[in-house]
Interface confidence: low
């Protein structure tokens, strides 16, 4: 069973001139999942992201999340990788407030 | 600072069941999941199993039948039992902690502690 | 299950030269899932490298790590002599979750 996860990516503000932005990956199975945000499409230090675990998310698929802090107008240059049982695909953050992407394979 | 220690008998007699426990500090076993290998003597490193923060567990098929891994979250220990051991499961046995973000690499390692199975 | 075989064995250098440590997988692994550890006798395996080619906090940069697909590679730029270990890579992309055999880099 393959189950592709939906990639939710938003944004919230942080100190002056920085902005969070997080990318959430839910409803997905198996559980093994690659989350990662890019710079200018190269993966950020894994000092620089923080990462949730992958936990159940009570409908027999998993949920997990990836987030880093960024400078606010540079929005453009990061994306979210994802890469789930042999396929991937990347987010961007979005201008508004959310951004909902459903992977199509 | 993040510390694994790996306690339990260090002479189990065949076909008993070897039980260890890796006690863990500087974390905490809800947020981090928890590896077990062993290297058997002079030889390569083994994946046993781990358990995930949600007590989920993945084992390796060679090891399926006999092993179990289990987790107290109130004592941050998780422990591995594998049973039915012959002179084949004598090795030093590792726990390790599942790195976050590292893909599930195994960031930290206890020192090890050596099993032999012998009668 | 994914075999990863490590080569050479053994590597015999001098402090100061390159060492370039092969592991070839049987299957393609996402790089994602490929990582490097080092032991040293008596020791726990200590991670060095996850995901193909980040490098741990406070691992020097003499070492690092590349490849895709099915082959990759760990490099020491310039062996000191605390070096010296047995290298192991290891795949997390499938179930079981196997190490190669190991390379021993000892002192020439």
């Known amino acids: 069973r393959r189950v592709p996860p939906m990639v939710n990516v938003t944004r919230s503000e942080a100190s002056e001139g920085n902005i969070t932005v997080t990318c959430r990956a839910s409803s997905f199975y198996p559980r093994n999942i690659t989350l990662t945000w890019r710079q200018d499409g190269v993966s950020l230090s894994h000092d620089t992201q923080q990462w949730g675990d992958v936990l159940p998310d009570g409908n027999g698929t998993y949920q997990t999340w990836v987030a880093t802090r960024i400078c606010q107008g540079e929005e453009q240059r990061f994306t979210c990788y994802m890469e789930h049982s042999g396929n991937h695909s990347t987010h961007p953050v979005p201008s508004g407030k959310v951004l909902v992407l459903q992977s199509h394979w | 600072q993040v510390q694994l220690q790996e306690s339990g008998p260090g002479l189990v007699k065949p076909s008993e069941t070897l039980s260890l426990t890796c006690t863990v500090s500087?974390?905490?076993?809800?947020?981090?999941?928890g590896h077990w290998i062993r290297q058997p003597p002079g030889k390569g490193l083994e994946w046993i199993g781990m358990?995930?923060?949600?007590?989920?567990?993945d084992y390796n098929a060679a090891f399926i039948s006999r092993v179990t891994i289990s987790v107290d979250t109130s004592k941050n220990q998780f422990s591995l039992k594998l049973s039915s051991v012959t002179a084949a499961d004598t090795a030093v046995y590792y726990c390790?902690?599942?790195?976050?973000?590292?893909?599930?690499?195994?960031?930290?390692w206890g020192q090890g502690t050596l099993v032999t199975v012998s009668s | 299950e994914i075999v990863l075989t490590q080569s050479p064995g053994t590597l015999s250098l001098s402090p100061g030269e390159r060492a370039t440590l092969s592991c070839t997988a049987s299957?393609?692994?996402?790089?994602?899932?490929l990582h490097w550890y080092q032991q040293k006798p008596g020791q726990a395996p200590r991670l060095l490298i996850y995901?193909?080619?980040n490098l741990i906090s406070g691992i020097p940069d003499r070492f690092s790590g590349s490849g895709s697909g099915t082959d990759f590679t760990l490099t020491i730029s310039r062996l000191e002599p605390e070096d010296f270990a047995v290298y192991y890579c290891?795949?997390?992309?499938?179930?079981?979750?196997?190490f190669g055999q190991g390379t021993k880099l000892e002192i020439k």
């Open positions: 390790a902690r599942k790195g976050h973000g590292y893909y599930y690499a195994m960031d930290y």
């Open positions: 500087g974390f905490s076993l809800t947020t981090y999941g």
């Open positions: 358990i995930w923060t949600d007590g989920w567990t």
């Open positions: 299957s393609s692994v996402s790089s994602s899932y």
């Open positions: 995901s193909t080619s």
């Open positions: 290891h795949q997390y992309h499938r179930s079981p979750f196997t």
